[in-house]
Amino acid sequence: LEASEEVELEPCLAPSLEQQEQELTVALGQPVRLCCGRAERGGHWYKEGSRLAPAGRVRGWRGRLEIASFLPEDAGRYLCLARGSMIVLQNLTLITGDSLTSSNDDEDPKSHRDPSNRHSYPQQAPYWTHPQRMEKKLHAVPAGNTVKFRCPAAGNPTPTIRWLKDGQAFHGENRIGGIRLRHQHWSLVMESVVPSDRGTYTCLVENAVGSIRYNYLLDVLERSPHRPILQAGLPANTTAVVGSDVELLCKVYSDAQPHIQWLKHIVINGSSFGADGFPYVQVLKTADINSSEVEVLYLRNVSAEDAGEYTCLAGNSIGLSYQSAWLTVLPEEDPTWTAAAPEARYTD
């Protein structure tokens, strides 16, 4: 997208109820105008669960989302809900680009491989577009887990990416289960990792102007018999209205006696993670599996402060397992929406 262009979704007609999620890359400084529903009965716009005011630099007004000049902090998930109902009219993520090509880890490949982009700007050597997604360098992953390494990059011409393992070209042909190379997502995915997957994984990003590289160090930890198993999908993402009661459920299976904790993720000094790489958490509930209803976390009379990420952590003599869910708390008068499920993560 050229910096002078305006990002628009037109016309302003009520879309189908089967609204697909969209991702749009927006150049810094670019104006944005997105429409949702008919002007007279336009929907309400929300950013990350908070309703946008009708005035200000970023505003939701008569069914329109308007951003005068796109800034990095404007990136994120935007939702438009029909007035007086829970119908999702628009569900999209705005991604920060720049005056050159840009890419997001999971964006539509067309958005940064458009040939019309290729000659619009001077040539540029590859550069990392999302270095914050590459901060975790030393990975220690239990055997059987899935590992995803990402090296989102851009440049002109659009660079290519290839992967090395311990300095050698890596295509996964000798790996049971193979690998998934998603070049348009700049990612390498390995499922059910085993000790032979240990090593240094290098992403090499190149174009005619130059090249950059980044190393991920992977260790695979063997654990037998097994740590607790948590039922998939639990706890579930939940949306509640202020003042209501919420129950989060966690189903734990374990041979060895498990110990269960409910945690709420918190922010300290503006950071969600401590120096050790683990998230800051507050312990809400702790007990053994035999305790009554330890697998349920009750939140009474929820307020906006209760919104956030909750984790069920189960441990036994072998190790730890955990799964997380998001609680979204909306004002009483506003319709509800359910946040996207967080990425599955492994314990470092």
Epitope: K136, K137, L138, P195, A275, D276
Partner: antibody, heavy 118, light 112 residues
Framework: EVQLLESGGGLVQPGGSLRLSCAAS????????MSWVRQAPGKGLEWVSS????????YYADSVKGRFTISRDNSKNTLYLQMNSLRAEDTAVYYC???????????WGQGTLVTVSS | QSVLTQPPSASGTPGQRVTISCSGS????????VNWYQQLPGTAPKLLIY???QRPSGVPDRFSGSKSGTSASLAISGLRSEDEADYYC?????????????FGGGTKLTVL
């Protein structure tokens, strides 16, 4: 208490060998990458070697490659550095350090002095 | 010769703000996060800043870090006499034969 305690330093002649140990306590040793860092008298910090939690992967500075070997015994919560063919320039205080997923050393031992001299 | 370049010394008076720079290349600071360590005389190093600008718990907010391109800096505001120490920047280096963990040569901070 979370701590690292080095031992094994001392005086050794050029060409000789020495084995350093680092006893860890208070954290899950087996899932942490560990490193050795040294500091020559009056000089700055220099990375020597790192090892993955399982011990399956090791990494070395060019200055010690082929002479030093890093290893660990997770059942004893102990990190080792076997130093062979020692040179005068290997004289330093050797620290062991616990690494985080972000590649930073959050925990350091108090250090052990290795002197290589004839 | 250290891979990362720091000024050998810096100084300031109590209450002042002091900045220490750290210069590297695309293979280290340009691609990896920067950490800062404080080493008080006769003691082991201590982590001061990680992930470019994050402080571990217990580190006063007088210490702050930043990174831009292939350079990083550590700022100390409201300088105190107990801040007199050696300060080291560090980052992983992903050059051809890497990975390596590299340090700056250290900056000796004197509180006048």
């Amino acid at each position: 208490e979370v701590q690292l305690l080095e031992s094994g330093g001392g005086l050794v002649q050029p060409g000789g060998s020495l084995r350093l140990s680092c006893a860890a306590s208070g954290f899950t040793f087996s899932s942490n990458y560990m490193s050795w860092v040294r500091q020559a008298p009056g000089k700055g910090l220099e990375w020597v070697s790192s090892i993955s939690g399982s011990g399956g992967r090791t990494y070395y500075a060019d200055s010690v490659k082929g002479r030093f070997t890093i290893s660990r015994d997770n059942s004893k919560n102990t990190l080792y550095l076997q130093m062979n063919s020692l040179r005068a320039e290997d004289t330093a205080v050797y620290y062991c350090a616990r690494m985080t997923v972000f590649g930073a050393a959050t925990l350091w031992g108090q250090g052990t002095l290795v002197t290589v001299s004839s | 010769q250290s891979v990362l370049t720091q000024p050998p010394s810096a100084s300031g008076t109590p209450g002042q703000r002091v900045t220490i720079s750290c210069s590297g290349s695309s293979s280290n600071i340009g691609s990896n996060t920067v950490n800062w360590y404080q080493q008080l005389p006769g003691t082991a190093p201590k982590l001061l800043i990680y992930r470019n600008n994050q402080r571990p718990s217990g580190v006063p907010d007088r210490f702050s870090g930043s990174k831009s391109g292939t350079s990083a800096s550590l700022a100390i505001s409201g300088l105190r006499s107990e801040d007199e120490a050696d300060y080291y920047c560090a980052a992983w280096d992903d050059s051809l034969n890497g990975p390596y963990w590299v340090f700056g040569g250290g900056t000796k901070l004197t509180v006048l």
